[in-house]
């Protein structure tokens, strides 16, 4: 999906009002400097591409993020403020339903959410170019 035409300010507002708190809640108990920042993004569409990937694509050691509150709110924000996003996600959603639904907070998931916090932080930078 090409995130170029999203309403970035509306997504930023959704992040600041609710998604950020859910990320904080998920990370509760984690040490500040436990994980290095290794994932980056250069502009807002790129940041959303990386955020989508880390939030919804299962990775080795962390298959359970998509059912978390911050993930569901991220999905809702993208669906509302990114034209045509919902349609591209139908197949992905059906595939996800076939996976196990048990929530397990592994260290790998915490590391991944730490990277997500960094990506969202970059997305919210006031001077970050949109293209």
């Amino acid at each position: 999906y090409d995130f170029t035409n999203c309403d970035f300010e509306k997504i930023k507002a959704a992040y600041l009002s609710t998604i950020s708190k859910d990320l904080i809640t998920y990370m509760s108990g984690t040490k500040s400097t436990e994980f290095n920042n290794t994932v980056s993004c250069s502009n807002r569409p790129h940041c959303l591409t990386e955020i989508q990937s880390l939030t919804f694509n299962p990775t080795a050691g962390c298959a359970s993020l998509a059912k978390e509150m911050f993930a569901m709110k991220t999905k809702a924000a993208l669906a509302i403020w990114c034209p045509g996003y919902s349609e591209t996600q139908i197949n992905a959603t059906q595939a996800m339903k076939k996976r196990r639904k048990r929530k397990v907070t592994t260290n790998k998931c915490l590391e991944q959410v730490s990277q997500l916090q960094g990506l969202w932080r970059r997305f919210n930078r006031p001077l970050l170019k949109q293209q």
Partner: antibody, heavy 118, light 107 residues
Framework: QVQLVQSGAEVKKPGASVKVSCKAS????????MHWVRQAPGQCLEWMGE????????DYNQNFRGRVTITVDMSASTAYMELSSLRSEDTAVYYC???????????WGQGTLVTVSS | DIQMTQSPSFLSASVGDRVTITCKAS??????VAWYQQKPGKAPKLLIY???MRHTGVPSRFSGSGSGTEFTLTISSLQPEDFATYYC?????????FGCGTKLEIK
């Protein structure tokens, strides 16, 4: 182990600028955010701003915007905080401090006293 | 910005006493609160993060609790080295803000 070593005390005249340094060691410099926090005599701790050394992006407390500039020298693993248009109420101890993506401060420099006096 | 209101500003107590310091946030900060101890001429030292997690090496007599807008730091049995100034800090929202401190003095 992580260490943050700051430059020595400074005495400045009102209207001048001061530049405080913070030399980091014991970790990969680009991995974490560097913050500056100040403490005026008998006052609260006040967060001034931060820098992401990986790309030198800065965020500042609105109270200091326009007067504070935070920079890094990657080759020296050193962060700098410059405060301009100094006034007597800027007399304070200035600390550098380190965080990851979660913004509480588990590592601090030893502090640098800046005195502004005519 | 979120305001962090700490009370009391000053507290006199004796060795062995149990003391409680409170911090109120002007809006919900979930559990994103840290507590620091500062002694004269020294940098603050992290005691508690995530409202209740003790930092490495911090004695078990220090404990934190709370969520939302009300938080407490408790020292169960004061030791001579505990007389210092204590600060709370919220890291839920940018800009990151501190309480104005509680100075704990020997009675």
């Amino acid at each position: 182990q992580v260490q943050l070593v700051q430059s020595g005390a400074e005495v400045k005249k009102p209207g001048a600028s001061v530049k405080v340094s913070c030399k980091a060691s014991g970790y990969t410099f680009t991995s974490y955010l560097m913050h500056w926090v100040r403490q005026a005599p008998g006052q609260c701790l006040e967060w001034m701003g931060e820098i992401d050394p990986s790309d030198s992006y800065t965020d500042y407390n609105q109270n200091f915007r326009g007067r504070v500039t935070i920079t890094v020298d990657m080759s020296a693993s050193t962060a700098y905080m410059e405060l301009s248009s100094l006034r007597s109420e800027d007399t304070a101890v200035y600390y550098c401090a380190l965080t990851g993506t979660i913004n509480y401060f588990d590592y601090w420099g030893q502090g640098t006293l800046v005195t502004v006096s005519s | 910005d979120i305001q962090m209101t700490q009370s009391p500003s000053f507290l006199s107590a004796s060795v062995g006493d149990r003391v409680t310091i409170t911090c109120k946030a002007s809006q919900d900060v979930v559990t994103a609160v840290a507590w620091y101890q500062q002694k004269p001429g020294k940098a603050p030292k992290l005691l508690i993060y995530w409202a209740s997690m003790r930092h490495t090496g911090v004695p078990s007599r220090f404990s934190g609790s709370g969520s939302g807008t009300e938080f407490t730091l408790t020292i169960s049995s004061l030791q001579p080295e505990d007389f210092a100034t204590y600060y709370c800090q919220q890291y839920s929202s940018f800009t990151f803000t501190f309480g104005c401190g509680t100075k704990l003095e020997i009675k």
